[in-house]
């Protein structure tokens, strides 16, 4: 058993049929010695008396808010949560495996630039009685500070018969130099509590590996005389690290119809303009990627050919 | 500690091309190592990230773009002094700081070159003959060093009398390649910045 936060404790259980469970001793936070009784949740049934209560925790029915009273007055609470371990593996029931970029990916993180700010998100099908707490650091043995905000519900989607909820959090490394060469990864830890179930999820990464620029901005087309070709130009996204001559981007320019199966024109360039063939009912799209360290491409920025 | 914006004349920067070749060569070599050593811990997640130039050169700090010198997190650097005559400098007016930056890059390359050559000598003794360093990568390191054209003491190649542990050597190769790739990215960014300035 260990303390998650004040008056909230996590009991780690090996979860298998007829498991013996864990013996837990609860102590009432009071100077009083006599006349103390214990109850669980809203029940008025007295579980025991005295300053301490010893319980055998085997299942979720044994978890919950234990309260010690004296003469009708509440003295203190202890909330017990269960953390299940099945076949030596901690449970991951609360969050959905996003399977990208590999299996068992519960947290996904992205950064728009090298400033040390990044966003992580996760998915769940659970809609109520759910709380998240996020901590982060650079390195684990001698951790350097990363400050994370509160996790918020950022999107709701319908997936077949199920509703899927996306939560996200923004974090900022306390003293980040955009030009630095990272040797210690960022660690992100998410505590998830659903009703009386506790789970924790972690992710470890270098900012350089989670870079995904915003789409290029200000796409403009200029038809070329006596030609099927048009010159398309754009600018670096505002959120990208500066100076741009140091933090350079490379671009992919594509002309395609509405369907992905349609034929296309495609060209890659380090410049902020390119010449492509425009077709009726097609659109020109441009996306960006770090020129020197190939992490993710940005989303597409698009303009119609016409 | 930083690079002034008004540096060489346009088109006078022969090192950009070599630095691009360097990044390409080390990326290819790293990819080859990951594929060939697929049963060794050779991915970014599996290896320890070591920097053999740590406390010996200060490339990131010495080559910091002017725009980032306002960022206090970028300025907790070590002071290091270097020789200041290089052919990539392209103009008499070149600042001391730029010379410091380029000589730091030169020292990085020299250190990695020695490490890679020592390692290759060991790998050539491996009866499995599983992986060797790409001669193209070694040649590209050499070309960039020549383009930088700094006079510097030659570092003797490390020789080892004990029987090499080939497993450890291959792990070390992965560690070196990952670190060198990161440094090659920094070098490419610096050369691009200087070329645009």
């Amino acid at each position: 058993i260990w303390e998650l936060k004040k008056d909230v404790y996590v009991v780690e259980l090996d979860w298998y049929p007829d498991a013996p469970g864990e013996m837990v001793v609860l102590t009432c936070d009071t100077p009083e010695e006599d006349g103390i009784t214990w109850t669980l949740d809203q029940s008025s049934e007295v579980l025991g008396s005295g300053k301490t209560l010893t319980i055998q925790v085997k299942e979720f029915g044994d978890a919950g808010q234990y309260t010690c009273h004296k003469g009708g007055e509440v003295l203190s609470h202890s909330l017990l949560l269960l953390h299940k371990k099945e076949d030596g593996i901690w449970s991951t029931d609360i969050l959905k495996d996003q399977k990208e970029p590999k299996n068992k990916t519960f947290l996904r993180c992205e950064a728009k630039n090298y400033s040390g700010r990044f966003t992580c998100w996760w998915l769940t099908t659970i809609s109520t009685d759910l709380t998240f707490s996020v901590k982060s650091s650079r390195g684990s043995s001698d951790p350097q500070g990363v400050t994370c905000g509160a996790a918020t519900l950022s999107a709701e989607r319908v997936r077949g018969d199920n509703k899927e909820y996306e939560y996200s959090v923004e974090c900022q490394e306390d003293s980040a130099c955009p030009a630095a060469e990272e040797s210690l990864p960022i660690e992100v830890m998410v505590d998830a509590v659903h009703k009386l179930k506790y789970e924790n999820y972690t992710s470890s990464f270098f900012i350089r590996d989670i870079i995904k620029p915003d789409p290029p901005k200000n796409l403009q087309l200029k038809p070329l005389k006596n030609s099927r070709q048009v010159e398309v130009s754009w600018e670096y996204p505002d959120t990208w690290s500066t100076p741009h001559s140091y933090f350079s981007l490379t671009f992919c320019v594509q002309v395609q119809g509405k369907s992905k199966r349609e034929k296309k024109d495609r060209v890659f360039t380090d410049k902020t303009s390119a010449t492509v063939i425009c077709r009726k009912n097609a659109s020109i799209s441009v996306r960006a990627q770090d020129r020197y360290y190939s992490s993710s491409w940005s989303e597409w920025a698009s303009v119609p050919c016409s | 500690r930083n690079l002034p914006v008004a540096t060489p004349d346009p088109g006078m920067f022969p090192c950009l091309h070599h630095s691009q070749n360097l990044l390409r060569a080390v990326s290819n070599m790293l990819q080859k190592a990951r594929q060939t050593l697929e049963f060794y811990p050779c991915t970014s997640e599996e290896i320890d990230h070591e920097d053999i130039t740590k406390d010996k050169t200060s490339t990131v700090e010495a080559c910091l773009p002017l725009e980032l010198t306002k960022n206090e997190s970028c300025l907790n650097s070590r002071e290091t002094s270097f020789i200041t005559n290089g052919s990539c400098l392209a103009s008499r007016k070149t600042s001391f700081m730029m010379a410091l930056c380029l000589s730091s890059i030169y020292e990085d390359l020299k250190m990695y070159q020695v490490e890679f050559k020592t390692m290759n000598a060991k790998l050539l003794m491996d009866p499995k003959r599983q992986i060797f360093l790409d001669q193209n990568m070694l040649a590209v390191i050499d070309e960039l060093m020549q383009a930088l054209n700094f006079n510097s003491e030659t570092v003797p190649q490390k020789s080892s009398l004990e029987e090499p542990d080939f497993y450890k050597t291959k792990i070390k190769l992965c560690i070196l390649l990952h670190a060198f790739r990161i440094r090659a990215v920094t070098i490419d960014r610096v050369m691009s910045y200087l070329n645009a300035s």
């Epitope: 099927r228 034929k263 296309k264 024109d265 380090d270 010449t275 063939i277 | -």
Partner: antibody, heavy 118, light 107 residues
């Protein structure tokens, strides 16, 4: 599968014209760009131009501008390349090729030998 | 137009050996570079597109790398069926142009 079958070999006199055909099968004809590339005996490859069968748009290499015409007949899924004012250095194998991407060549025809000789 | 230069013109290699073919552009063409193989009496065949992207059905011993002005096609271990002429082609701008070719012959 995608296939391109070209017309047979031709022998032409200098100053004449030649029209080579290329019949496509195995895909929706208007879904791919069609290019023509030629290769003189013992020489390299030379791009001549492309046509979009969907709308008849064309782009020709400057070297052939005014001397070449590329057309398509969607009813028969056939592309044509006509080269006029033939010279002896137009002696080459002419290839048609198709791709969903405009700028490189995925599927090639077997080639048509055109000999220009007096 | 962009004139592509391939080297060497002829490469003599023993079966099982590694072959490295080079293609140069006079200006940066990013990764707009494609490789073809042509055997005598046959049409060319696409091997690699956009400098390093492999084509399904093409053996894994063929790999491409490079960007900007210098590109490489590597055949890791030459098989008898790989002796042919190899062409690079730029797609950075029209007109599309090919290199002069590299003939890979048996040593």
């Amino acid at each position: 599968q995608v296939q391109l079958v070209q017309s047979g070999a031709e022998v032409k006199k200098p100053g004449a014209s030649v029209k080579v055909s290329c019949k496509a099968s195995g895909y929706a004809f208007t879904d791919y760009y069609l290019h023509w590339v030629r290769q003189a005996p013992g020489q390299g490859l030379e791009w001549m131009g492309w046509i979009d069968p969907e709308n008849g748009d064309t782009e020709y290499a400057p070297k052939f501008q005014g001397r070449v015409t590329m057309t398509t007949d969607t009813s028969t899924s056939t592309a044509y390349m006509e080269l006029r004012s033939l010279r002896s250095d137009d002696t080459a194998v002419y290839y048609c090729n198709a791709n969903k991407e405009l700028r490189y060549f995925d599927v090639w025809g077997q080639g048509t030998m055109v000999t220009v000789s007096s | 137009e962009i004139v592509m230069t391939q080297s060497p013109a002829t490469l003599s290699v023993s079966p099982g050996e590694r072959a490295t073919l080079s293609c140069r552009a006079p200006q940066s063409i990013s990764i707009n570079l494609h490789w073809y193989q042509q055997k005598p009496g046959q049409a060319p065949r696409l091997l690699i597109y956009f400098a390093s992207q492999s084509i399904s059905g093409i053996p894994a011993r063929f790999s491409g790398s490079g960007s900007g002005t210098e590109f490489t096609l590597t055949i890791s271990s030459l098989q008898s069926e790989d002796f042919a002429v190899y062409y690079c082609q730029q797609s950075n701008s029209f007109p599309l142009t090919f290199g002069g070719g590299t003939k890979v012959e048996i040593k």
